[in-house]
C-alpha cells in the first residue's frame, strides 16, 4: 500500500490520543533502554510502511501482534485516514475477544513493540519537520 495520500496530521493525533497509550501499556515493566532501535524510516509514508509491516506481518519469533489492541487501533486509524486502505470500518468488539485469548508476551514481541514506538516517534518528528 502507498501511504502517500494519507492524512498524516490526523494519524498523528490518533497516535497521541490512543495508540501510544496502548503501546506503552504493552511495554509496561520494561525500560526504554532495554532494546536498541534497529529499524528506522526516512519520511512519513515510509514510516507508515514500516509501522504496518512490524504491526501486521507475523515474524517467526513474534506472531501475535496483529491481535493486540494497539494493532487494531492502528488498522482503524489507517482505514479512516488513508484512502483505499480498508474497505470497511474496523470494529473493536471482535478484536477484544481475540486479544483476550492469548496474553503471553514474549521478549521478542516486546522488542518489536519497542521498535514500533521508535518508528511512531520518528513519524511524528518527520511531521514536525515538514511543518
Amino acid at each position: 500500500y502507498d501511504f502517500t495520500n494519507c492524512d498524516f496530521q490526523k494519524i498523528e493525533a490518533d497516535y497521541l490520543r490512543t495508540i501510544s497509550k496502548d503501546l506503552i501499556t504493552y511495554m509496561s515493566g520494561t525500560k526504554s533502554t532495554d532494546f536498541n532501535n534497529t529499524v528506522s524510516c526516512s519520511n512519513r509514508p515510509h514510516c507508515l510502511t514500516e509501522i504496518q509491516s512490524l504491526t501486521f506481518n507475523p515474524t517467526p519469533r513474534c506472531a501475535s501482534l496483529a491481535k493486540e489492541m494497539f494493532a487494531r487501533k492502528t488498522k482503524a486509524t489507517l482505514a479512516l485516514w488513508c484512502p483505499g486502505y480498508s474497505e470497511t470500518q474496523i470494529n473493536a468488539t471482535q478484536a477484544m475477544k481475540k486479544a483476550r485469548k492469548s496474553k503471553v508476551t514474549t521478549n521478542k514481541c516486546l522488542e518489536q513493540v519497542s521498535q514500533l514506538l521508535g518508528l511512531w516517534r520518528r513519524f511524528i518528528r518527520t511531521l514536525l519537520k515538514k511543518q
Epitope: N5, R17, T18, R72, K73, A76, T77, A79, L80, W81, C82, P83, G84, Y85, S86, E87, T88, Q89, I90, N91, A92, T93
Partner: antibody, heavy 121, light 112 residues
Framework: EVQLVESGGGLVQPGGSLRLSCAAS????????MTWVRQAPGKGLEWVSS????????YYADSVKGRFTISRDNAKNSLSLQMNSLRAEDTAVYYC??????????????WGQGVLVTVSS | DIVMTQTPLSLSVTPGEPASISCRSS???????????LHWYLQKPGQSPQLLIY???YRASGVPDRFSGSGSDTDFTLKISRVEAEDVGVYYC?????????FGGGTKVEIK
C-alpha cells in the same frame, strides 16, 4: 479538478428499467467507496446504495433491494446503477457521490450535479 | 434502522447573528474505536449538497471556520457563528455508523 458527472436519467414507465452512469475524474477512483443518494422532488436526501473501492462490499436501502444493482469499473473510473422494476416512488434526482466506505468515516465529500429520473405512465 | 431527527424544521436568521441546528439519533453513533459517525451537509438552492462537517467536528476542505460541529453519542449540533447570505439552504445530518445510512429530514435556513 475532482469531478463526478452523472448520465442516463430520463422518463420511464412503471415497471421499466434505466441505467445511470457516473464518470469520475481528478482523483484515484479505485481508492474510494462510492454511493448513490437520491432526492424526491421537494423532499430530503435518501441513501440508496454504496459500494466499497474493490467492490467487496455492497449495500442497498430496503426500498431498492432486489431491484437496483450498483457496480463499478475501476479501469474506466465509472460507477453504475442499474434500476429495474421502477416505481413512481423512485422518481427523484439521483446523485453520484464519493464516500460511504471506511475513509473519512464514510462521509460523502464529492457530489455530482445529479440526474433526474421520472417514473410515470 | 437508525432514525435521525433534526430541529428546527426551519430557521430565519439575521445576517451576522449565530445559528444553531440540532440533530438527534435514535441510537449511539459512537464507533468502538472512539469516533462518532455523524456528518453535516448543506444544500444551497438549486445546487447539489456539499459536505460541511464529518465525524462530528472535522471541517471539510474549504469550509469557512464560522461552521462548527459538536456533540456526542446521540445529540449533535451544527453552529454557524455569524450567518452570511451565502449560508442559506437546507442543512442535513447523516449517520454512517451502520447501513442503511440515514439522513435527517433537513433544516431550512433563510435570511431575515
Amino acid at each position: 479538478e475532482v469531478q463526478l458527472v452523472e448520465s442516463g436519467g430520463g422518463l420511464v414507465q412503471p415497471g421499466g428499467s434505466l441505467r445511470l452512469s457516473c464518470a469520475a475524474s481528478g482523483f484515484t477512483f479505485s481508492n474510494y467507496g462510492m454511493t448513490w443518494v437520491r432526492q424526491a422532488p421537494g423532499k430530503g436526501l435518501e441513501w440508496v446504495s454504496s459500494i466499497t473501492f474493490a467492490s467487496s462490499y455492497i449495500y442497498y436501502a430496503d426500498s431498492v433491494k432486489g431491484r437496483f444493482t450498483i457496480s463499478r469499473d475501476n479501469a474506466k473510473n465509472s460507477l453504475s446503477l442499474q434500476m429495474n422494476s421502477l416505481r413512481a416512488e423512485d422518481t427523484a434526482v439521483y446523485y453520484c457521490t464519493r464516500g460511504g466506505g471506511a475513509y473519512y468515516g464514510g462521509s460523502l465529500d464529492v457530489w455530482g450535479q445529479g440526474v433526474l429520473v421520472t417514473v410515470s405512465s | 434502522d437508525i432514525v435521525m431527527t433534526q430541529t428546527p424544521l426551519s430557521l430565519s436568521v439575521t445576517p451576522g447573528e449565530p445559528a444553531s441546528i440540532s440533530c438527534r439519533s435514535s441510537q449511539s453513533l459512537l464507533h468502538s474505536y472512539g469516533y462518532t459517525y455523524l456528518h453535516w451537509y448543506l444544500q444551497k438552492p438549486g445546487q447539489s449538497p456539499q459536505l460541511l462537517i464529518y465525524l462530528v467536528s472535522y471541517r471539510a476542505s474549504g469550509v469557512p471556520d464560522r461552521f462548527s460541529g459538536s456533540g456526542s453519542d446521540t445529540d449533535f449540533t451544527l453552529k454557524i457563528s455569524r450567518v452570511e447570505a451565502e449560508d442559506v439552504g437546507v442543512y442535513y445530518c447523516e449517520q454512517t455508523l451502520q447501513t442503511p445510512y440515514t439522513f435527517g429530514g433537513g433544516t431550512k435556513v433563510e435570511i431575515k
